[in-house]
C-alpha cells in the first residue's frame, strides 16, 4: 500500500498529551525507531511519569482514506476479552505548511490526533519544494512552534553590514519566488531557503534538510546546507551552510529582524530574537484573554463580544463580513454554521460562507503583535478551510465606546485579514517570565 502523504514520510513527528504527561512519536509511512515499542510501531506512546512505552498503532495494520489514517494494534484495550483493540486515528485537514500533529483526546481504545498540513490539500498551491518540521518540544514537553514565521511567498532580509550582498532566508522551507517575484528574489534558485544576492546574481547557500532542534530551553536551531556538489567560487572551496538560532527573549518585547552574527567561507550564522521561539503557552490562548504569570501580560478582548444577535460589519468590496468575536452567539446570516466570521456575497446574499468558527479560536500575542485567529471555516476549492486573522492595534480613543470596529484589509488563499483599532487591545505588561 502506497504511503498516503509522502511529504510527511521523511520524519518521525511528535505530539504531546500535556494532561497526562505523555509524548507520542508518529511515523506515518514506516515505523518509529524506538525499541521498546517494537519493530513495527507507527505510533509509540512514551509515558514520562512511569518511563514506559506502549505501541498504540502498528504500521502493518494501517488503513487510509484521503483525510483519515488509522493504525490498529493487536492489543486488547480492556481486560474483558472483547474484540476491541487499541488504535490511533489521525484526521488530516488542509493547511498552508507541513504543520504539526496535535493530540486531541484519547478514549480507552482510541488515541485521536488532528493534523493541518499541505499534504492533505486537494491542490498543490501550498506545497513547498522542500520543507522540514518547524516545531519542537522541550524537556518540559512545552511546544515551541515556528510555523507562524514560515513565509508562503517572499523572504526575510537578514540584517548584515555588508553593502555588496543581501542574504534572504525563509523559515523551515524554501523561498517561493513565483508567488511573490520581488525584483531581488527573482533570480534565487528553486529550492533555496537561504539566498545570497550579489548585484544581479543570486546563489543558493542553503536548503532545509533537518527539522528544528532545541539546544536549550529558549534557543532553537535550524540548519540549512547547499545540497548541490558544485562549489561557489567565492567560498574558498567550502560548502555553504546557514545556521539560524532563534532566541526567546527574557522579557516581552517588540519583534526584531534576523541578524547575521558571523560569516566565514560561506558559513553564515544568524541570530533571531523572537517570541515565536518561546513556548506556545506563553504566546497563545484558546480564550479571548491572555493573563497570568505565565504570559507576562494582561489582555482581555471579551468586552468586544456582541450580544443580542448584533454583529460587527466589515465591507470587503464584493463581500460583507459579519463578525462576532469572543463569544458563541450565532451570526444570523450564518445560521447554524457556528461562525465567528461570516462572509456574505453582496450580489447574492444566499452565498454565505463561514470564514472561521467560534470554537476554533486562537488569541496570540507575539513580538508585539496581538492577533485573534478563527479557523475551521467552510472549505475552499483547495480543501483549505477558510480562516480569518484579526490584527489588533491599541487605540485609547477608539469610537463605539472604545470598542472600535474591524476593517477588512484583504484575502490571500482563503485567509481573510482584518485590522481592528480598539482600547481593549492596549496591553498591560508584567515583569519577567
Amino acid at each position: 500500500q502506497a504511503a498516503p502523504f509522502p511529504e510527511l514520510c521523511s520524519y518521525t513527528w511528535e505530539a504531546v498529551d500535556t494532561k497526562n504527561n505523555v509524548l507520542y512519536k508518529i511515523n506515518i509511512c514506516g515505523s518509529v525507531d524506538i525499541v521498546q515499542c517494537g519493530p513495527s510501531s507507527a505510533v509509540c506512546m512514551h509515558d514520562l511519569d512511569t518511563r514506559t512505552y506502549h505501541s498504540v498503532g502498528d504500521s502493518v495494520l494501517r488503513s487510509a482514506t484521503r483525510s483519515l489514517l488509522e493504525f490498529n494494534t493487536t492489543v486488547s484495550c480492556d481486560q474483558q476479552g472483547t474484540n476491541h483493540r487499541v488504535q490511533s486515528s489521525i484526521a488530516f485537514l488542509c493547511g498552508k505548511t507541513l504543520g504539526t500533529p496535535e493530540f486531541v483526546t484519547a478514549t480507552e481504545c482510541v488515541h485521536y490526533f488532528e493534523w493541518r498540513t499541505t499534504a492533505a490539500c486537494k491542490k498543490d498551491i501550498f506545497k513547498a519544494n522542500k520543507e522540514v518540521p518547524c516545531y519542537v518540544f522541550d524537556e518540559e514537553l512545552r511546544k515551541h512552534d515556528l510555523n507562524p514565521l514560515i513565509k508562503l511567498s517572499g523572504a526575510y532580509l537578514v540584517d548584515d553590514s555588508d553593502p555588496d550582498t543581501s542574504l534572504f532566508i525563509n523559515v523551515c522551507r524554501d523561498i517561493d519566488t513565483l508567488r511573490d517575484p520581488g525584483s531581488q528574489l527573482r533570480a534565487c534558485p528553486p529550492g533555496t531557503a537561504a539566498c545570497l544576492v550579489r548585484g544581479h546574481q543570486a546563489f543558493d547557500v542553503g536548503q532545509p534538510r533537518d527539522g528544528l532542534k532545541v539546544v536549550r530551553k529558549d534557543r532553537l536551531v535550524l540548519s540549512y546546507v547547499r545540497e548541490e556538489a558544485g562549489k561557489l567560487d567565492f567560498c574558498d572551496g567550502h560548502s555553504p551552510a546557514v545556521t539560524i538560532t532563534f532566541v526567546c527573549p527574557s522579557e516581552r518585547r517588540e519583534g526584531t529582524i534576523p541578524k547575521l552574527t558571523a560569516k566565514s567561507n560561506c558559513r553564515y550564522e544568524i541570530e533571531w530574537i523572537t517570541e515565536y521561539a518561546c513556548h506556545r503557552d506563553y504566546l497563545e490562548s484558546k480564550t479571548c484573554s491572555l493573563s497570568g504569570e505565565q504570559q507576562d501580560v494582561s489582555i482581555d478582548l471579551t468586552p468586544l463580544a456582541q450580544s443580542g444577535g448584533s454583529s460587527y460589519i466589515s465591507d470587503g468590496k464584493e463581500y460583507l463580513f459579519y463578525l462576532n468575536v469572543c463569544g458563541e452567539t450565532e451570526i444570523q446570516f450564518c445560521n447554524k454554521k457556528q461562525a465567528a466570521v461570516c462572509q456574505v456575497k453582496k450580489s447574492d446574499t444566499s452565498q454565505v460562507k463561514a470564514a472561521g468558527r467560534y470554537h476554533n479560536q486562537t488569541l496570540r500575542y507575539s513580538d508585539g503583535d496581538l492577533t485573534l485567529i478563527y479557523f475551521g471555516g467552510d472549505e475552499c476549492s483547495s480543501g483549505f478551510q477558510r480562516m480569518s486573522v484579526i490584527n489588533f492595534e491599541c487605540n485609547k480613543t477608539a469610537g463605539n465606546d472604545g470598542k472600535g470596529t474591524p476593517v477588512f484589509t484583504g484575502e490571500v488563499d482563503c485567509t481573510y485579514f482584518f485590522t481592528w483599532d480598539t482600547e481593549y487591545a492596549c496591553v498591560h505588561h508584567h515583569h519577567h517570565h
Epitope: K19, N21, V22, D78, A106
Partner: nanobody
C-alpha cells in the same frame, strides 16, 4: 486539603482476588491521571497501572491480564481489581494522582499479602 486514601488490602491466598480502593478529596478528580504503584519489602517502588484522565489504561507486564484499573468519578474513587494473585504481588500498594496544575499526590498505602 488534597488527600488520597487507599483501602481494601489484606491477606489473601495465592490465586485469590482483592479490590483496592483509592478515595480522593480536595481535587477535581476527573481531571487527574491516576496511577497505582507498589513497593515490596527491600525493593524499590514500582509502577503497576495507569488510568489517564481521558480513560486509556496501561499495565505493567507483570500484572497484565490479571489486574484491572477503573474509576468512579461520582465517588471520586479509583479501583484496582487484582485477580490470580501470586506471592510476588505481596507489597504495599499506593495510589497517585497527577495533573498539569498539581504536584503529584500520593496516598499512605495499603498492605497486600499473598500467602498460603
Amino acid at each position: 486539603q488534597v488527600q488520597l486514601q487507599e483501602s481494601g488490602g489484606g491477606l489473601v491466598q495465592p490465586g485469590g482476588s482483592l479490590r483496592l480502593s483509592c478515595a480522593a478529596s480536595g481535587i477535581i478528580f476527573s481531571d487527574n491521571r491516576m496511577d497505582w504503584y507498589r513497593q515490596a519489602p527491600g525493593k524499590q517502588r514500582e509502577w503497576v497501572a495507569t488510568l489517564a484522565s481521558y480513560g486509556w489504561k496501561t499495565y505493567a507486564d507483570s500484572v497484565k491480564g490479571r489486574f484491572t484499573i477503573s474509576r468512579d468519578n461520582t465517588k471520586n474513587t479509583v479501583y484496582l481489581r487484582m485477580n490470580s494473585l501470586k506471592p510476588e504481588d505481596t507489597a504495599v500498594y499506593y495510589c497517585k494522582a497527577s495533573s498539569p496544575v498539581l504536584n503529584d499526590i500520593w496516598g499512605q498505602g495499603t498492605q497486600v499479602t499473598v500467602s498460603s
